[in-house]
């Protein structure tokens, strides 16, 4: 797994370094995640052929990922940092769910789908600390999550694997515009 | 060619119990989720467990109707399912399938062995 | 859980008809557009046996004249032309989710 964000050897080797702002810390924390992502994705896709599946079959799913939309207020065109902030990790909230059924998924990676996990739920951390509004922020209920989990853990083998395919994929795609909303604010 | 042998069946008193064993060949058995369903005049098909080993990691599922009474296991150096069934009941009778789960979903099955709860 | 309701529980065809068996999921079994049907021909004293998969998919040496078709939650069997050999039991089963179910049956004789 690789190294967490703040304790790299650059860091060691440079102790008189600024330390990092609370902007550079997230931006820092959104790349390591998309590095583990990226390293997940590499496992599932030697595994089985999800990843030359058409965008028409994942389109047609029927799990309610996160997904950057215009009304969001995170793309260039209408941007508004504090609605953007609060999709960002109401985003990230819901996304947990899914990344909790992604834990057994992996053989190699196990590790790497640990680390993904847990320095997602530090990002939410700094971010909650960013924004301003927190009551605009909702928290998925865990009743309905416990029960999503069941249904996503009982799907036949094929199923499992396009929905790896498919979280990995949403998930890497909601961080990539939640980084570029972020270095707007 | 997929084959399934089911052995153990036959006559139980009520609260009793049986195991069932079932011997697969034809295919790469350890990658498979293995299953025990059975068939009974009154019921029809009904599933009963499922094993499934998922990135070295064993998840097991029972129907309701026997949780806490049957349980699944395997041995994949024997490439074998077995189902050990405790405090059996009159509606446990029927016919138990050894059935693999593949990939994409559907079944293949055994020829069955018949378990009759009686007194 | 997914509960499958089919119909009709009984039917009798001449030779050389077409019979049809529908089958209602109470949910959809269908994700990433494939639907998870299967369908089980079942002759006295015998396992079942697979004739359609992924509600269109043939099993292997099963003969042309058996075809599946719907989707999300109607789906239904086609024998055609029927011939003497087809008189069984036929169920259909969700592969979707764990708890794999099964409809109640539906006996087909020759008329």
């Known amino acids: 797994a690789p190294v967490p964000p703040g304790e790299d050897s650059k860091d060691v080797a440079a102790p008189h370094r600024q330390p990092l702002t609370s902007s550079e810390r997230i931006d820092k924390q959104i790349r390591y995640i998309l590095d583990g992502i990226s390293a997940l994705r590499k496992e599932t896709c030697n595994k089985s052929n999800m990843c030359e599946s058409s965008k028409e079959a994942l389109a047609e799913n029927n799990l309610n990922l996160p997904k950057m939309a215009e009304k969001d207020g995170c793309f260039q065109s209408g941007f508004n940092e504090e609605t953007c902030l609060v999709k960002i990790i109401t985003g990230l909230l819901e996304f947990e769910v899914y990344l909790e059924y992604l834990q057994n998924r992996f053989e190699s990676s196990e590790e790497q789908a640990r680390a993904v996990q847990m320095s997602t739920k530090v990002l939410i951390q700094f971010l909650q600390k960013k924004a301003k509004n927190l009551d605009a922020i909702t928290t998925p209920d865990p009743t309905t999550n416990a029960s999503l989990l069941t249904k996503l853990q009982a799907q036949n083998q094929w199923l499992q694997d396009m929905t790896t395919h498919l979280i990995l994929r949403s998930f890497k795609e909601f961080l990539q515009s939640s980084l570029r909303a972020l270095r707007q604010m | 060619e997929v084959k399934f042998e089911e052995s153990g069946g036959g006559l139980v008193q009520p609260g009793g119990s049986m195991k069932l064993s079932c011997v697969a060949s034809?295919?790469?058995?350890?990658?498979?989720?293995m299953n025990w369903v059975r068939q009974s005049p009154e019921k029809g098909l009904e599933w009963v467990a499922e094993?499934?080993?998922?990135?070295?990691?064993?998840?097991?599922y029972y129907a309701e109707s026997v949780k806490g009474r049957f349980t699944i296991s395997r041995d994949d150096s024997k490439s074998s399912v077995y189902l050990q069934m405790n405090n059996l009941r009159a509606e446990d009778t029927g016919i138990y399938y050894c059935a693999s789960l593949f990939y994409d979903g559907y079944l293949h099955w055994g020829q069955g062995t018949l378990v009759t709860v009686s007194s | 859980d997914i509960v499958l309701t089919q119909s009709p529980a009984s039917l009798a065809v001449s030779l050389g008809q077409r019979a049809t068996i529908s089958c209602r999921a109470s949910e959809s079994v269908g994700n990433f557009g494939i639907s998870f049907m299967n369908w089980f021909q079942q002759k006295p004293g015998q396992p079942p046996k697979l004739l359609i998969y992924t509600a269109s998919n043939q099993g292997s040496g099963v003969p042309a004249r058996f075809s599946g078709s719907g989707s999300g939650t109607d789906f239904s069997l086609n024998i055609h032309p029927m011939e003497e050999d087809d008189s069984a039991m036929y169920f259909c089963?969700?592969?979707?989710?764990?708890?794999?179910?099964f409809g109640g049956g539906t006996k087909v004789e020759i008329k």
């Open positions: 094993i499934r080993l998922t990135s070295n990691k064993q998840a097991i």
């Open positions: 089963q969700q592969s979707k989710e764990i708890p794999w179910t």
């Open positions: 034809g295919f790469s058995f350890s990658n498979y989720w």
